[in-house]
Amino acid sequence: EEELQVIQPEKSVSVAAGDSATLNCTVSSLIPVGPIQWFRGAGPGRELIYNLKEGHFPRVTAVSDPTKRNNMDFSIRISNITPADAGTYYCVKFRKGSPDVELKSGAGTELSVRAKPSAPVVSGPAVRATAEHTVSFTCESHGFSPRDITLKWFKNGNELSDVQTNVDPAGKSVSYSIRSTARVLLTRRDVHSQVICEVAHVTLQGDPLRGTANLSEAIRVPPFLEVTQQSMRADNQVNVTCQVTKFYPQRLQLTWLENGNVSRTEMASALPENKDGTYNWTSWLLVNVSAHRDDVKLTCQVEHDGQPAVNKSFSVKVSAHPKEQGSNTAAENTGTNERGSSDYKDDDDKHHHHHH
């Protein structure tokens, strides 16, 4: 009689996670009588997957009815495949005995599991960074197989190049993870900007997964300050304004100092947003010139988003002569804007605070 052959026709089978895998095995002869067993792996550490003769294997069913007369088909179906099921499966013929004796193994079928990557999660810096600085964003996705994967970063639709990406583990595994870091230069115009991490994988059928992060969570745009004096009023009061422009986020505290003494402190709230996502705020201070003998040094002090205060000072010249109604008071702008240019103008709406 010709020697029994155990035939596993497929060298490899690839299955999507969650699907069923069919592992085919036929024998060439009814002789000798004895059961078939399926194992994952070879050698002493192999794992029993299915034993026709005995045992409980809830996820495994025989493709062919084992009680069918003259059955020579010992293919099995494994349901609800997960990446942990990946490996090489062997169909092994045993000769009936007490105990049954291993006779011959098939060549093996490698089961690879196609598992989708998890939705990419993008995280930004723990604390805000000031515009014109570079920050890092990370993107993570897990649980995919096979290992080949493509990850791209975009800022406002433009691909980023300062990127470092790692896929782990480096060796063979049932599933893999990817972690990528992108370095992004923040600009003052980035309040409404977005970074996107895009992951492409064979399991996604050309429809990549995306994770996003808004730069508004990461950026701080410091304000420009400008202090100006309006015309003298009939009641000998001078109106001095402090224009705070183009800042983000809204968290801002403004303090007026007269000759170094705190005159008033205000907190910004419910400001309208500029088109670029920044905010403007104007604060007015009325100075009664007739109450002062000497020049008055006014300082607009702004503390933005917990950062060190920025000052802009302005001297109101008090003349020895009585003021003419409606005439300008001699004034000297002695302040410096420590962040940006004082002639930075903005046509967006201002939010005015009037103080009398």
Epitope: I31, V33, G34, N51, K53, E54, P66, T67, R69, N70
Partner: antibody, heavy 119, light 110 residues
Framework: QVQLQQPGTELVRPGASVKLSCKAS????????INWVKQRPGQGLEWIAM????????HYNQIFKDKATLTVDKSSNTAYMQLSSLTSGDSAVYYC????????????WGRGTSVTVSS | DIVLTQSPASLAVSLGQRATISCRAS??????????IFWYQQKPGQPPKLLIY???NLDSGVPARFSGSGSGTDFTLNIHPVEEEDAATYYC????????FGGGTKLEIK
């Protein structure tokens, strides 16, 4: 290892019925046919019928079609054969046997139940 | 139905000699290259025991002095050399269709 356990004896009245049991162990009960065989004292073997425990498909020897009824209880891994309208001609040893190779053969046998029909 | 006829009904063989038992089917029991004949041994007070399957294949644990041969309709069980423990009744069975048994052959050891 494979075992088929059968009660040793059954004493029944003529005209009555008897339900013989065959409890299987040491293998997956639903994957192999169970056969029943009759042997009268000093006589040869007669094949009665077979049942597939997975779906209770049965095949009967025409001679026993109206005499024997095969059933299984998968929860207890037990095969049953009910013999009805018993006469002295039904006095015999009844064996259950498992078909391990799906060849309609009998690889493993129970020890048999001796049925005596007597008033 | 296929009828199996065994011969002889009984035979006595000296220890160490050859015992030959024949089984003839009323029609061929061969199919797809296999001969669906099985041989069983039964000792008094015991259930039968499978010796040979598919005409010529020794079951697990069966001594090599037992052998089976034949095809189509004519089959033979040989025991050589016969030993005392071989005293028993031997049955052939076919499974080409639904199973039937031959009438049995009683072997005595002289």
């Amino acid at each position: 290892q494979v075992q088929l356990q059968q009660p040793g004896t059954e004493l029944v009245r003529p005209g009555a019925s008897v339900k013989l049991s065959c409890k299987a162990s040491g293998y997956t009960f639903t994957n192999y046919w169970i056969n029943w065989v009759k042997q009268r004292p000093g006589q040869g073997l007669e094949w009665i019928a077979m049942i597939d425990p997975s779906d209770s498909e049965t095949h009967y020897n025409q001679i026993f079609k109206d005499k024997a009824t095969l059933t299984v209880d998968k929860s207890s891994n037990t095969a049953y054969m009910q013999l009805s309208s018993l006469t002295s001609g039904d006095s015999a040893v009844y064996y259950c046997a498992m078909d391990y190779g799906s060849l309609y053969a009998m690889d493993y046998w129970g020890r048999g139940t001796s049925v005596t029909v007597s008033s | 139905d296929i009828v199996l006829t065994q011969s002889p009904a009984s035979l006595a063989v000296s220890l160490g000699q050859r015992a030959t038992i024949s089984c003839r089917a009323s029609k061929s029991v061969s199919s797809s290259g296999y001969n669906y004949i099985f041989w069983y041994q039964q000792k008094p007070g015991q259930p039968p025991k499978l010796l040979i399957y598919l005409a010529s294949n020794l079951d697990s644990g069966v001594p090599a002095r037992f052998s089976g041969s034949g095809s189509g309709t004519d089959f033979t069980l040989n025991i050589h050399p016969v030993e005392e423990e071989d005293a028993a009744t031997y049955y052939c069975q076919h499974s080409r269709e639904l199973p039937t048994f031959g009438g049995g052959t009683k072997l005595e050891i002289k």
